[in-house]
């Protein structure tokens, strides 16, 4: 920044430093040289002289003005002409920005990733505001009425060993920045409620070549969580349509989900679980591809999922840029 | 000020019900989380339910499928309907904003064996 230079006089902004973009602003400079009466004063945005808008207020003060000022970050600096000075001299600068208030936090969000040990707390933050924004996250507990409060820029990870008020709490975010303060909804929630599975993976397929050809989809997960429920979607790669499957699954066993597919196409699988009856779902797992034979039987498994010459052997590839598919990792 | 003002308490026989209601000033009720809590003699004071702005809601194990919480946003009122009453669940019934600390004097509630 330009901030820690030595003055010759000062300068400043109206209405303020950091303001609302779009405003019009008026940056004064006031110099202060000895033996300088300045001749004429100078701005100087990002390095660049400003030609217009400049209007002499008095023998040592200027005032630069702009209108429907757009952008974030700016250095502003001044300098005078000086008789008998060869150089212009500097006066002061000064780094100003500009950005919105922060919008209403909405949709936050707290879950517990089985074995993490944390909960993850996530919001929307509304547009973009270019400046310096933090976030407080409240937690506090409905049991005991104690409250933690945490500082963040995005989201927050608080250890589950710190949640030490019970199981119910109360969640609510509060933004801020130096044009505005919002605070979010509060959310209301039970720790045992919104703990995610340990992720679900698909690790194989094969095709069985039975009378009717049959694909049988391998797929676990670490969970210890007894009553889980899981939906396994998959498409043609080249349609835009999912089939979903659901199941009820107990995860003491590898899994083995079957399913009838037309011959020589190329399909694509994920998998998703939640604990049963609960409010939110792990992200889609990662795509896994599988090509169905012509007729003879074939296994493609994850060790395999990247693109391989057609030789007889397995075909099976995997390139997650080639797909429009909605494969946010969406928890809600 | 917010006022938080409870009622509808009274003595009651074991396996009878009784609905508590709280009247809040202003729009608190459209815009938090209401709560209600109980402080028999002797005892902390113990969250019963809660309920948020979408109408989910929170209970305490002790209570979970014979008490009920809800809420009229546009009567600024909070309600607790209380069924197959305990004798342990005498005690002051107390209407609260978490998110802020504001409480209500209480209302009375005893059921008697």
């Known amino acids: 920044g330009i901030t820690n230079i030595n003055c010759s006089g000062h300068i400043w902004v109206e209405p303020a430093t950091i303001f609302k973009m779009g405003m019009n602003i008026s940056i004064y400079c006031q110099a202060a040289i000895k033996n300088c009466q300045p001749r004429k004063l100078h701005f100087y945005k990002n390095g660049i002289k400003e030609r217009f808008q400049i209007t002499r207020i008095n023998k040592t003060t200027a005032r630069l003005w702009y209108k429907n000022f757009l952008e974030p970050h700016a250095s502003m600096y001044c300098t005078a002409e000086c008789p008998k000075h060869f150089q212009e001299t500097l006066i002061c600068g000064k780094d100003i920005s500009s950005g919105y208030p922060p919008d209403i936090p909405d949709e936050v969000t707290c879950v517990i990733y089985e074995y993490s040990g944390n909960m993850t707390c996530t919001w929307n933050a509304g547009k973009l505001t270019y400046i310096d924004t933090k976030y407080v996250v409240h937690v506090k507990s409905l049991e005991t009425e104690e409250e933690q409060q945490y500082l963040t820029s995005s989201y927050i990870n608080i250890s589950t060993d710190s949640l030490q008020g019970g199981k119910k709490y109360l969640v609510w975010v509060q933004a801020a920045n130096a044009l505005g303060m919002e605070e979010s909804k509060q959310l209301q929630i039970h720790l045992d409620d919104i703990v995610i599975p340990s992720a679900a993976v698909i690790s194989r397929a094969e095709t069985i070549n039975a009378t009717v050809p049959k694909t049988i989809i391998y797929w676990d997960s670490q969970t210890t969580i007894e009553k889980v429920s899981c939906e396994m979607r998959y498409k043609a790669t080249t349609n835009q349509t999912w089939n979903v499957k659901e199941f009820d699954t107990n995860f003491t066993y590898v899994q083995q989900s079957e399913f009838y597919l037309e011959p020589n196409i190329k399909y694509v699988f994920q998998v998703r679980c939640q604990e049963t009856g609960k409010r939110y779902w792990q992200p889609w797992s990662s795509l896994f591809f599988h090509k169905t034979p012509e007729t003879v039987p074939q296994v493609t498994s994850k060790a395999f999922q990247h693109d391989t010459w057609n030789s007889g052997l397995t075909v099976a590839s995997i390139s997650t840029g080639h797909l429009t598919s909605d494969n946010r990792g969406d928890i809600g | 000020e917010v006022q938080l003002v409870e009622s509808g308490g009274g003595l009651v026989q074991a396996g009878g019900s009784l609905r508590v209601s709280c009247l809040a000033s202003?729009?608190?009720?459209?815009?938090?989380?209401m709560a209600w809590y109980r402080q028999a003699p002797g005892k902390q004071r113990e969250l019963v339910a809660s309920?948020?702005?979408?109408?989910?809601?929170l209970y305490a194990d002790s209570v979970k499928g014979r008490f009920t919480i809800s809420r009229d946003s546009a009567k600024s009122m909070v309600y607790l309907q209380m069924n197959s009453l305990k004798p342990e669940d005498t005690a002051v019934y107390y209407c609260?904003?978490?998110?802020?600390?504001?409480w209500g004097q209480g209302t009375q509630v005893t059921v008697s064996s």
């Open positions: 609260n904003v978490p998110r802020y600390g504001y």
């Open positions: 202003g729009n608190i009720v459209s815009r938090n989380v």
């Open positions: 309920v948020d702005t979408g109408g989910s809601t």
